[in-house]
């Protein structure tokens, strides 16, 4: 049979290297030789390129080399397939070399901030050595912060006569390290060069861009004063490398601004002892270049009633994230403060907190929380300067099977009944939320039975047992990941009861 007609012809001019055309050869049943027929020099010259490879995949491409390539130029390319049964020709294809030229990438040699110009870096590069002198080049510059994985892109063109191979990238974050890469193409071409090697550069430092402020209210002491733990951190979106030399804090009773107290610290938290009335706390951070904007927080009076609006809250794990969702009865509340810390018996030292706006859910990557640890999560509604009553739940980012089963006892042994009791597994051993307990029991040499009860139940009465029979009993505590058995206990039912 005749060879299949070559289809999908595609050509690329690897500038000053070769012009390579490829095609889809179709299903070959016998050895097929391909000849690429070309007219060039605007139709004034023609020649052929014949594939000489023995492997079929390499036979579907052919290259022309200098000096028989000119640009600008118009080509016609036709592929002929020949086997023992005859010759078949492809459609004639037409190519403008400027449209299919592909150059080497440019070389970035410097990325630097420009003195006194904020949030900008200047990129300097060398044009690819092998690029058509008669064409302008277009460029794509891609950039990202060092700790990000998603690139941003900006496109621009340079005139071929332009000696100045620089670009000013603006609108960046201050004092942030960026990764830069550049690619180029002949202005008329659809083929971009590969990306250049990446180069790093950093924007200039600025004054700190702001703070987020929070508090932990503790019960009033005997003298009526109340300890308040102030917590703060860099505002979201602040540069990772932003330096802070210290913090200025000032606070005063809401009723009397004249009683302002000020203090300085280099720590990221501070314990204040305030009177029973409401207070305002303000703070700024500073470095050698200036001060941040002021962050302000109102501390309510001890007897002040806080509003309640969260009606229901639940946590679940989805796609490597812990998701907390809640429902609110107050439509005007759209800012929430989330607090979370491990539920350990000691005083919580590692309190984490984060605000959420315009949403009634909060997500955290699973790997930011310890697996098999129970976390207390509280959500505070915030309306203007008021903080509402929190709603709290417990959740695990990842559950495991309990590391030990329940400690079990047998009580009230009767002729046909017995009470099985067990203790809650210590928090540190649960590894997840206990969702149920299963009691397994079996008469000596007999068939096994089981009964499952919910996690609020810590005892269960077995009935319809056999008189004067030895039993073995075991209680399993289960989380969503599976269950762990406690130790097994033996008991023997009585032969008769005092009531008989």
């Amino acid at each position: 049979a005749l060879p299949a007609k070559p289809e999908n012809i595609s050509c690329v001019y690897y500038y000053r290297k070769n012009l390579t055309c490829t095609w889809s050869p179709g299903k070959e049943t016998s050895y097929t030789q391909y000849t690429v027929k070309r007219t060039y020099a605007f139709g004034e010259k023609h020649d052929n390129c014949t594939t000489n490879s023995s492997t079929s995949e390499n036979r579907a491409s052919c290259s022309f080399f200098l000096p028989r390539i000119t640009i600008p130029d118009n080509y016609t390319i036709e592929v002929e397939a020949e086997n023992g049964d005859g010759v078949i020709k492809s459609h004639m294809t037409y190519w403008r070399l400027e449209n299919i030229a592909k150059t080497e990438p440019p070389k970035i040699f410097r990325v630097k901030p420009v003195l006194g110009i904020k949030r900008m870096i200047q990129i300097e590069w060398i044009k690819p050595e092998l690029a058509p002198v008669s064409s302008d080049l277009k460029y794509t510059l891609r950039f990202r912060t060092v700790n990000s994985t998603s690139w941003m892109e900006v496109n621009f063109a340079k005139n071929r006569k332009d000696k100045n191979q620089t670009y000013n990238l603006t609108g960046l974050q201050p004092f942030t390290e960026y990764v830069i890469a550049l690619r180029c193409a002949v202005k008329e071409s659809k083929f971009w060069s590969d990306w250049s090697q990446e180069k790093m550069g950093m924007t200039e430092e600025e004054a700190p861009c702001g703070l987020e402020l929070w508090r932990v209210l503790k019960p009033a002491e005997a003298d009526g004063r109340r300890p308040v733990r102030l917590l703060w951190k860099k505002a979201r979106g602040a540069p990772v490398l932003e330096k802070t030399l210290g913090y200025n804090i000032w606070y005063y009773p809401e009723s009397n601004t004249n009683l302002t107290e000020t203090m300085n610290t280099t720590n990221q938290q501070l314990e204040l002892h305030l009177g029973g009335e409401s207070f305002w706390v303000s703070m700024i951070s500073y470095n050698s270049l200036g001060k941040s904007p002021v962050a302000t927080l109102r501390i309510p009076a001890i007897q002040e009633k806080s509003f309640q609006c969260i009606e229901v809250m639940q946590a679940c794990v989805a796609e490597d994230q812990l998701v907390v969702k809640w429902q609110s009865s107050a439509l005007d509340v759209n800012t929430w403060m989330i607090e979370w810390f491990p539920d350990v018996d000691s005083e919580p030292t590692t309190l984490s907190w984060e605000s959420v706006s315009q949403a009634t859910n909060w997500t955290i990557q699973q790997d930011k929380l310890k697996p098999f640890w129970c976390y207390n999560i509280s959500v505070y509604p915030m309306l203007h300067d008021k903080v509402g009553e929190p709603y709290s739940i417990q959740a695990y980012a990842k559950e495991g099977v309990p590391s030990e089963g329940p400690e079990t006892k047998v009580e009230n042994i009767g002729v046909k009944t017995v009470t099985i009791t067990w203790k809650e597994i210590p928090k540190s051993e649960r590894k997840g939320i206990i969702c149920n307990y299963t009691i397994f029991y079996q008469a000596e040499g007999g068939k096994g039975f089981s009964k499952t009860v919910n996690s609020s139940i810590l005892q269960y009465g077995l009935e319809s047992l056999k008189r004067k029979t030895s039993y073995i009993v075991q209680v399993m505590a289960s989380t969503s990941a599976g269950g762990t058995n406690g130790t097994s206990i033996n008991f023997k039912t009585l032969s008769f009861s005092v009531f008989e």
């Epitope: 290297k17 640009i71 008669s134």
Partner: antibody, heavy 121, light 107 residues
Amino acid sequence: QVQLVQSGAEVKKPGASVKVSCKASGYTFTGYVLNWVRQAPGQGLEWMGLINPYNGGTDYNPQFQDRVTITADESTSTAYMELSSLRSEDTAVYYCARDGYDDGPYTLETWGQGTLVTVSS
Amino acid sequence: DIQMTQSPSSLSASVGDRVTITCQASEDIYSFVAWYQQKPGKAPKLLIYNAQTEAQGVPSRFSGSGSGTDFTLTISSLQPEDFATYYCQHHYDSPLTFGGGTKVEIK
């Protein structure tokens, strides 16, 4: 800047061979074709052949086909022209010359300084 | 092979003169002609290619014209540094051939 520096003058006996080198600098060696042209004393220019250092492809003037070999060493950016079976009429200045224009194939834009080869018994 | 016949083989002219050198190809070579200038003891220098395109850095007094088989190099106003030998060359395909040269001397 683009430069082609050729090896020094040679004196050879008839029947011998000569190998002239041409070291390129200031550009991407594999991106341009190198030609060899000779000029006998008081005579015109005669093209001998070319090499494309990118793929090692050569093209020779049929007049020299069986006597000339043009090679290129990418690692040193150097091209070589070897002419064998020398006779007295091969006495000439031998030039290497690089093409340079995208829209002008086979044009000789940059030339070496020339190498005088004298064939004499 | 394509033969290139150049004329005249020599000419005498004065500074400021308009000088014309012609070259005839033995077959149609479209516009694939280049012109070179060579001074004694020096390598040739490319002046014109594609019959009429000036090479980089070439003074505008040098111009080329023609297509097919007949080509011309014109120096509009001869300068002292223009006294040299001029060669035409076809760059249609290999083998490349040159004209015999035209020596421009001071009158």
